[in-house]
Interface confidence: low
Amino acid sequence: ASVIYVYVQDYRSPFIASVSDQHGVVYITENKNKTVVIPCLGSISNLNVSLCARYPEKRFVPDGNRISWDSKKGFTIPSYMISYAGMVFCEAKINDESYQSIMYIVVVVGYRIYDVVLSPSHGIELSVGEKLVLNCTARTELNVGIDFNWEYPSSKHQHKKLVNRDLKTQSGSEMKKFLSTLTIDGVTRSDQGLYTCAASSGLMTKKNSTFVRVHEKPFVAFGSGMESLVEATVGERVRIPAKYLGYPPPEIKWYKNGIPLESNHTIKAGHVLTIMEVSERDTGNYTVILTNPISKEKQSHVVSLVVYVP
């Protein structure tokens, strides 16, 4: 079905009411490359039309380039030129008489999302029954509204909670922050997998993902490749890593011939036992004991260090 508009020239009413359903409101983005059309259509094609913006009062006239008026389209102008204004209207001069269109409220809408950050961003491990809390923060330009969408393995989770809120930014800041927090009170094995948060401003979407690992219960074990014999020559630096699997990360304690080792300037006893300059007296049996901080389960492993004198 085609629609025909009949224009009747009327010098007493040169502007005609817009047929647009967004009559009276113009939406703009503060983007130097975008133009906006104020739909003040004319019943006369060769009018001298200017655009008035307020406040403060400013007048824009067609420049034969990016600012123009067309009776069938309206007044076209780069968005950023009127982004300061609360309202605009078109004005025509006929025989020294001024005629004004209706007022159009200017609504500045942003769309650009700078980034979406998940926290924690990686290495998330839990055991069954623990609480998972994932924060998704979107940073955007001003005047943006954000919709968050989460995708995760067990979307029908009964104990899931989603909270979205705007974050306060410093006054004068050129950006907005939005936060969506996903909480699952008691995770199960089916909650293991990829968690994706997508932030959408309508015209732009950005997303980020992280992997969540869920263990049946807290545990600790030595990983493959844990050495039982280390050989070194006097003066070398010796590194003996405690290769483990476990959740949560275990407490690690090193012993030499049954005596606890403490870190000092010659030896570092962390998840890697480091002897800065090995000597003959460092020869012996080193025991590493892993303790799970929740279950208190312990695992031990003995490494024999042999030091050769050249």
């Epitope: 939406y27 983007n31 490359n33 975008k34 809408v109 999302i113 919709d147 969408n149 959408s200 401003s201 309508g202 015209l203 732009m204 979407t205 950005k206």
Partner: antibody
Framework: QVNLRESGGGLVKPGGSLRLSCAAS????????MNWVRQAPGKGLEWVAS????????FYTDSVKGRFTISRDNSRSSLFLQMNSLRAEDTAIYYC??????????WGQGTMVTVSS | DIQMTQSPSSLSASVGDRVTITCKAS??????LNWYQQKPGEAPKLLIY???ILETGVPSRFSGSGSGTDFTFTISSLQPEDIATYYC?????????FGGGTKLEIK
């Protein structure tokens, strides 16, 4: 299974009209911006129109403004493209695509529109 | 409108080769760029968004880089199933525009 299926394509004379539909399934249709993208035979991709999740914002490429209308019915998980005053240069496969303007992450298989006398 | 210039328009490579496609924007588009793969008779498929982020489920041999006006898409080791046309797309400013495409063939 996330799926988009277009329908409504066909042969039409220049100046004629067609209404394309896209049926969505497997995701929350009402949460996503939806788009139409077209591809003329043997040519590249061209974005046609976008409509935001609640139909608050609608965007068109210049060549179809005033002739094409994008709309959606979230209750039926459906996207539409009403095409009027069709021209020979509108001949193309029309794809329905999910996602915002940032990235079209799910595409339908397309429906062919041929404008010829 | 922002013009996206893709090069080359076609290229022939052998299985196992490293393949690089470039995309140049007529204006600064920050990192607002996507890459798509379209196999003959199929719909396009999103591979990379935000210039360098791999879409979920896409093999790690595909990668993207660049910002501003110059962008690169790389296949580290070409596989027979990678035969397709590849498109870049900017989403910095409306209208959204695609590159002309790069048709990739096996030698």
């Amino acid at each position: 299974q996330v799926n988009l299926r277009e329908s409504g394509g066909g042969l039409v004379k220049p100046g004629g009209s067609l209404r394309l539909s896209c049926a969505a399934s497997g995701f929350t249709f009402g949460s996503y911006t939806m788009n139409w993208v077209r591809q003329a035979p043997g040519k590249g991709l061209e974005w046609v129109a976008s409509i935001t999740s609640g139909s608050s914002y609608i965007f068109y490429t210049d060549s179809v403004k005033g002739r094409f209308t994008i709309s959606r019915d979230n209750s039926r998980s459906s996207l539409f493209l009403q095409m009027n005053s069709l021209r020979a240069e509108d001949t193309a496969i029309y794809y329905c695509a999910r996602g915002s303007a940032s990235a079209f992450d799910i595409w339908g298989q397309g429906t062919m529109v041929t404008v010829s006398s | 409108d922002i013009q996206m210039t893709q090069s080359p328009s076609s290229l022939s490579a052998s299985v196992g080769d490293r393949v690089t496609i470039t995309c140049k924007a007529s204006d600064d588009i920050i990192n607002y760029l996507n890459w798509y793969q379209q196999k003959p008779g199929e719909a396009p498929k999103l591979l990379i968004y935000d210039a360098s982020i791999l879409e979920t489920g896409v093999p790690s041999r595909f990668s993207g880089s660049g910002s501003g006006t110059d962008f690169t898409f790389t296949i580290s080791s070409l596989q027979p199933e990678d035969i397709a046309t590849y498109y870049c797309q900017q989403y910095d400013i409306l209208p959204l525009t695609f590159g002309g495409g790069t048709k990739l063939e096996i030698k």
